[in-house]
């Protein structure tokens, strides 16, 4: 999995008037990292993990850069011609990656009211856009503005590839964004479903990175996909993730079922508690 830095900038307009505030979220290796909120832009590390990477000294730099980017995006929104009444949003998502073989990828995506209308490969400078006429109109509009305003927005729109990679390398150099692995805590709970049936739920929490396999097994053999229900893998606010898988079984059959977990090359299996015992932590490492 490559190292990545992802910027998500959002600006708003109301009744055709671009609002002064904006929102920027930065993800480092898929983790919420910095946040610039609408009223005042302050680079806020999301939890201890980002504190460790940034340190107090670099916050001003992030704040300055993100504020500049927000201004540029507000100017872009102002030049979108089909502003209608009510609330509208322009979003720019920029991603750069450094792969294990040191190759790099960078891209930029624009969304209007949540709909993608323009993408650019920042290495090849190649633009792509969806087929819909609305997207095409918006895309032409924005591209024309970017060309006209090339001097003002040169740093933002043409050096982005280099800037993003430079920042990512700086964060990696700080030594904290090493490929850390945090193993999940897994627990199994049961709840009564209909008469004679129970729902067993296997929850994994506090793990990083986000890739995880969680599934139910009966008599040691994987259950079919359609007999299991999965939750999304979601950030838990601590720089780690959580998810769950559930299935319905006959009461009394608990001893035939185990939850299987695989994460970053580590595996564990977790049994279902019988009877009134509600949670059982597995002895598997």
């Amino acid at each position: 999995e490559p190292h990545s830095l992802r910027y998500n900038l959002t600006v708003l307009s109301w009744d055709g008037s671009v609002q002064s505030g904006f929102l920027t979220e930065v993800h480092l290796d898929g983790q919420p990292f910095l946040r610039c909120d609408r009223q005042k832009c302050r680079a806020k590390p999301q939890g201890q993990w980002a504190e460790d990477v940034l340190g107090n000294k670099t916050w001003d730099r992030e704040t300055r850069d993100l504020t500049g980017n927000g201004k540029d995006l507000r100017m872009t929104l102002a030049h979108i011609k089909d502003q209608k009444e009510g609330l509208h949003s322009l979003q720019e998502i920029r991603v750069c990656e450094i792969h294990e073989d040191n190759s790099t990828r960078s891209s930029q995506h624009f969304y209007y009211d949540g709909e993608l209308f323009l993408s650019q490969n920042l290495e090849t400078k190649e633009w792509t856009m969806p087929q819909s006429s609305r997207a095409q109109t918006l895309a032409m509009n924005v591209r024309n503005f970017l060309k006209e305003d090339a001097m003002k927005t040169k740093t933002h729109y043409h050096a982005m590839h280099a800037d993003c990679l430079q920042e990512l390398r700086r964060y990696l150099k700080s030594g904290v964004v090493l490929r850390r692995t945090v193993p999940p805590m897994v627990n199994v709970t049961r709840s009564e479903a209909s008469e004679g049936n129970i729902t067993v739920t296997c929850r994994a929490s506090g793990f990083y990175p986000w890739n995880i396999t969680l599934s139910w097994r009966q008599d040691g053999v994987s259950l079919s996909h359609d007999t299991q229900q999965w939750g999304d893998v979601l950030p838990d606010g601590n720089g780690t993730y959580q998810t769950w898988v559930a299935t319905r079984i006959c009461q009394g059959e608990e001893q035939r079922f185990t939850c299987y977990m695989e994460h970053s090359g580590n595996h564990s299996t977790h049994p279902v508690p019988s009877g009134k015992v509600l949670v059982l932590q597995s002895h598997w490492q």
Partner: antibody, heavy 118, light 107 residues
């Protein structure tokens, strides 16, 4: 510490009945089933079946249907194997093993040697 | 029933050797295979589940691999306490069946 402690060696005559016990320590007895495994002298391991320690329902492998019975004394965290109408070919060491997820024998008793003479 | 075959019933090796014990199934078992160790005093222990997952407390010199019908247990650096008989067991289908065992001895 998880432990399964079995009863001592048995010397029986053909036609008699034997009851072997397996007492569990260190875990919640009703959360895991109990397997029984036979090992004839100088031979490999043969799975006899298992008992669900929560419901008490036994499952027997085909070769062990009829004369063999699994039972429980849940309050004492103990599983039992009873063999009726003993035959010479029942001479073996019998192991209980904790049934993890109904696919794995994760903790074993020390074995109970049964000798059947004619 | 699925037949599990351990063709080598006994094996001699020197301390420090790398030893591989094989096990084959009469039909594909999709990695649903466990390994057990039986010491000379009869004590049985789980070593590996699901082809390659080490049970807690098992030394890392033990490893398992395989797929389809062919599986193996490897001891990378033979130690005196590894002298034992090793059994494979499938759980792809009922009844659960074991291999005949491979007895490991010191040269």
């Amino acid at each position: 510490q998880i432990q399964l402690v079995q009863s001592g060696p048995e010397l029986k005559k053909s036609g008699e009945t034997v009851k072997i016990s397996c007492k569990a320590f260190g875990y919640t007895f009703t959360n895991y089933g109990m397997n029984w495994v036979k090992q004839a002298p100088g031979k490999g391991l043969k799975w006899m079946g298992w008992i669900n320690t929560y419901t008490g329902e036994p499952t027997y492998a085909d070769d062990f249907k009829g004369r063999f019975a699994f039972s429980l004394e849940t309050s004492a965290s103990t599983a039992y194997l009873q063999i009726n109408h003993l035959k010479n070919e029942d001479t073996a060491t019998y192991f209980c093993a904790r049934n993890y997820g109904n696919y794995l024998f994760d903790y074993w008793g020390q074995g109970t040697t049964l000798t059947v003479s004619s | 029933d699925i037949q599990m075959t351990q063709t080598t019933s006994s094996l001699s090796a020197s301390l420090g050797d790398r030893v591989t014990i094989s096990c084959s199934a009469s039909q594909g078992i999709s990695n649903y295979l466990n390994w057990y160790q039986q010491k000379p005093d009869g004590t049985l222990k789980l070593l590996i589940q699901y082809t390659s997952l080490l049970h807690s407390g098992v030394p890392s010199r033990f490893s398992g691999s395989g797929s389809g019908t062919e599986y193996s247990l490897t001891i990378s650096n033979l130690e005196p306490e590894d002298i034992a008989t090793y059994f494979c067991q499938q759980y792809s289908k009922f009844p659960r069946t074991f291999g005949g065992g491979t007895k490991l001895e010191i040269k």
